[in-house]
C-alpha cells in the first residue's frame, strides 16, 4: 500500500511524506520565508530603489544569495540523483500499483519544485538587476571621480607651473639683491675712502682756516688802525685848512670832515680806495646790521660783491630756508651771502649779475645779466633777470620768467616733485629747470650723468657737475 501526507515540522518548514509498503520517504523542501520579507527596505521582488546601496553591503548580500542558490542547486541535484538511483525499482512498483495516487504526489512535488525554482530564478534575476544597477552607479561614480581627478591633476600642474615661475622670479630677484648688495658694498667702500680723504682734507683746511682767521684778525686790527689814522689825518688837514683860510673869505674849501666808514657793497669800498680783493664788512641798507662778504676787486674792473661761491665741496649747500636767508659758509671759501641782504641791496639800486663758471677740463665761461634783483621774502625771494650776454650759453640757464626760491624745507617750485630735495640745495627752481649752482659737489671723473650736481645746462649740458662757480653783483652805473 502507499499513501501521501503533507505536514509542517516544529521549525515551520513544510515536509512531504510518501508511504510505500514498508518504506517511508520524507522530503524537506527549502522555504522562501527564510529570505527577507517584502516589508524590508530592500524588496525581494521589486526594482532597485534610488537610495544607493553601500558597496560592501551589496557585495555581502550578493554572496549570501549566491550561496543560497548554490545550496538549492546542490539539493536539487542530490534529489534528482536519489530519485534516479534509489527509486527506480520502487517507482516501477509505484507506477504499477498506485499510478493515480503517485502521479498526483509526483505532480505536486514537481509543481512545488518548479515553483521554488521559478521563485529562486526570479530572486536571482532581481539580484542580477540590483547588481547591474549598482555596478552602473559605481561606474558613474568612478567616471565622476576620474573627471575630478583629472581636474585636480590639471590644477596641480598649473600650480606647479606657477610655483616654478615664482621660483624663477624669486631666483632672479635674489640675484638682483645680491648684485645690489655687491654694488652697495663697493659704493660703501668707495664712500669710506672718500670720507677718509675728506677728513684729511678737512683737518688740513681747519689748520689753514685757523691761520687765515689769525691773519684776518690782524688785518682787521690793522684796518681799524688805518681807518683811525686816516680819520685823524683828515681832521688835521681840515684844521690846517681852517687855519689857513681867511676868516672873511666866503669860498672855503669843502672837504669831508669824516671819511665814510660803512659800506653797502663792494663797489663803494672800491671807490673809497680799497682795491684789494678780500673780506670786507658791509652794512644793510637803512640799518646798522652788518654782514661779511668777499669783494672781488680784480675781475672786470673790480667792485664785485660775491653772493655765491663753490670750489671744492667743503660746505654743505643742502640748507634750510633760514640759512639761505641769513647766509652760511665762509667768505674765504664756499659760501652763500644771504637772500635777505641781496634782496634789500638790489631793491634800492639797479644791479648787474655776473656768473663765472669753470669745468673740469680747464675751461671757463660767464653769463652777465644787465639787470638783476630779488623780490622780498614775502615773494619767496623771486629772481628777476634781463639782458643776458656772455659765453656760458645764449639762453638763460636760470628759468625765465624768474622762479621763487626753494629750499629743502620750503617748496616753492612749479614741479609735482620737490626739486630742492630731489636735486639738493636751495635755488630758483622751476620744474626743476636748466640750472642749480647750489647742487651736490662732485669731484672729477664722478661729475657726469648726475641728477643733483652743480648744473648750468646751456653751457655744459645736462648731468655735468661743474668744478667752480661764482655769482657776483655790482651797481649797473659802476
Amino acid at each position: 500500500y502507499s499513501n501521501f501526507r503533507k505536514s509542517v515540522d516544529s521549525t515551520g518548514r513544510r515536509q512531504y511524506q510518501v508511504q510505500n509498503g514498508p518504506c517511508s520517504y520524507t522530503f524537506l523542501l527549502p522555504e522562501t520565508d527564510s529570505c527577507r520579507s517584502s516589508s524590508s527596505p530592500y524588496m525581494s521582488n521589486a526594482v532597485q530603489r534610488d537610495a544607493p546601496l553601500d558597496y560592501d553591503d551589496s557585495v555581502q548580500r550578493l554572496q549570501v544569495l549566491e550561496n543560497i542558490l548554490e545550496n538549492n542547486t546542490q539539493w536539487l541535484m542530490k534529489l534528482e540523483n536519489y530519485i534516479q538511483d534509489n527509486m527506480k525499482k520502487e517507482m516501477v512498483e509505484i507506477q504499477q500499483n498506485v499510478v493515480q495516487n503517485q502521479t498526483a504526489v509526483m505532480i505536486e512535488i514537481g509543481t512545488s519544485l518548479l515553483n521554488q525554482t521559478a521563485a529562486q530564478t526570479r530572486k536571482l534575476t532581481d539580484v542580477e538587476a540590483q547588481v547591474l544597477n549598482q555596478t552602473t552607479r559605481l561606474e558613474l561614480q568612478l567616471l565622476q571621480h576620474s573627471i575630478s581627478t583629472n581636474k585636480l591633476e590639471k590644477q596641480i600642474l598649473d600650480q606647479t607651473s606657477e610655483i616654478n615661475k615664482l621660483q624663477n622670479k624669486n631666483s632672479f630677484l635674489e640675484q638682483k639683491v645680491l648684485d645690489m648688495e655687491g654694488k652697495h658694498s663697493e659704493q660703501l667702500q668707495s664712500m669710506k675712502e672718500q670720507k677718509d680723504e675728506l677728513q684729511v682734507l678737512v683737518s688740513k683746511q681747519s689748520s689753514v682756516i685757523d691761520e687765515l682767521e689769525k691773519k684776518l684778525v690782524t688785518a682787521t686790527v690793522n684796518n681799524s688802525l688805518l681807518q683811525k689814522q686816516q680819520h685823524d689825518l683828515m681832521e688835521t688837514v681840515n684844521s690846517l685848512l681852517t687855519m689857513m683860510s681867511s676868516p672873511n673869505s666866503k669860498s672855503s674849501v669843502a672837504i669831508r670832515k669824516e671819511e665814510q666808514t660803512t659800506f653797502r657793497d663792494c663797489a663803494e669800498i672800491f671807490k673809497s680806495g680799497l682795491t684789494t680783493s678780500g673780506i670786507y664788512t658791509l652794512t644793510f641798507p637803512n640799518s646798522t646790521e652788518e654782514i661779511k662778504a668777499y669783494c672781488d676787486m680784480d675781475v672786470g674792473g673790480g667792485g664785485w660783491t660775491v653772493i655765491q661761491h663753490r670750489e671744492d665741496g667743503s660746505v654743505d649747500f643742502q640748507r634750510t630756508w633760514k640759512e639761505y636767508k641769513e647766509g652760511f659758509g665762509s667768505p674765504l671759501g664756499e659760501y652763500w651771502l644771504g637772500n635777505e641782504f641781496v634782496s634789500q641791496l638790489t631793491g634800492q639800486h639797479r644791479y648787474v649779475l655776473k656768473i663765472q663758471l669753470k669745468d673740469w677740463e680747464g675751461n671757463e665761461a660767464h653769463s652777465l645779466y644787465d639787470h638783476f634783483y630779488l623780490a622780498g621774502e614775502e615773494s619767496n625771494y623771486r629772481i628777476h633777470l634781463t639782458g643776458l650776454t656772455g659765453t656760458a650759453g645764449k639762453i638763460s640757464s636760470i628759468s625765465q620768467p624768474g622762479s621763487d626760491f626753494s629750499t629743502k624745507d620750503s617748496d616753492n617750485d612749479k614741479c609735482i616733485c620737490k626739486c630742492s630735495q630731489m636735486l639738493s640745495g636751495g635755488w630758483w627752481f622751476d620744474a626743476c629747470g636748466p640750472s642749480n649752482l647750489n647742487g651736490q659737489y662732485y669731484p672729477q671723473k664722478q661729475n657726469t650723468n648726475k641728477f643733483n650736481g652743480i648744473k648750468w645746462y646751456y653751457w655744459k649740458g645736462s648731468g655735468y657737475s661743474l668744478k667752480a662757480t661764482t655769482m657776483m653783483i655790482r651797481p649797473a652805473d659802476f
Epitope: C415, I416, C417, M422, N449, F451, K455, S462
Partner: nanobody, 129 residues
C-alpha cells in the same frame, strides 16, 4: 653710477626697420622716464619718443608718430625703440636719456630736454639706398 648704453643702430634701406635698445644701470625704470633723442649733422638735438610708468605713458614727436614704437622691459632694465618705414631724414645719432619721473611741471605731460641728466653715448642710424 648711472650708465645708459644704446645699441641696434646701423645702415638700412628706406622703408626698412631697426630696433634700438637702451640698457640702463644704476637706476630702475620704475622711477625714471627714458627718452630717445636724435641729432643729425649740423642740427639741434631733438626729442623723438619717451616712456614712463613702465609703459603707462608714452610720447612721440609728430615726425615719427605711427612709424616708431617705444616699449620697456623692466626685468631687463631696458627700453626699446622699434623704428619702421624708415626715411632718409631719420638718419642721425640716436641717444637715450633718463630723468627722474617725478621731475614734471604741474599740468605738463613730458620733460624739456634739459631735465634729462643722464645720457648714453649714442648709436648711429643711417637710412640710405
Amino acid at each position: 653710477e648711472v650708465q645708459l648704453v644704446e645699441s641696434g643702430g646701423g645702415l638700412v634701406q628706406p622703408g626698412g626697420s631697426l630696433r634700438l635698445s637702451c640698457a640702463a644701470s644704476g637706476i630702475t625704470l620704475d622711477d625714471y622716464a627714458i627718452g630717445w633723442f636724435r641729432q643729425a649733422p649740423g642740427k639741434e638735438r631733438e626729442g623723438v619718443s619717451a616712456i614712463r610708468e613702465s609703459g603707462g605713458s608714452t610720447y612721440y614727436a609728430d615726425s615719427v608718430k605711427g612709424r616708431f614704437t617705444i616699449s620697456s622691459d623692466n626685468s631687463k632694465n631696458t627700453v626699446y625703440l622699434q623704428m619702421n618705414s624708415l626715411r632718409p631724414e631719420d638718419t642721425a645719432v640716436y641717444y637715450c636719456a633718463a630723468v627722474p619721473a617725478g621731475r614734471l611741471r604741474y599740468g605738463e605731460q613730458w620733460y624739456p630736454i634739459y631735465e634729462y641728466d643722464a645720457w648714453g653715448q649714442g648709436t648711429l642710424v643711417t637710412v640710405s639706398s
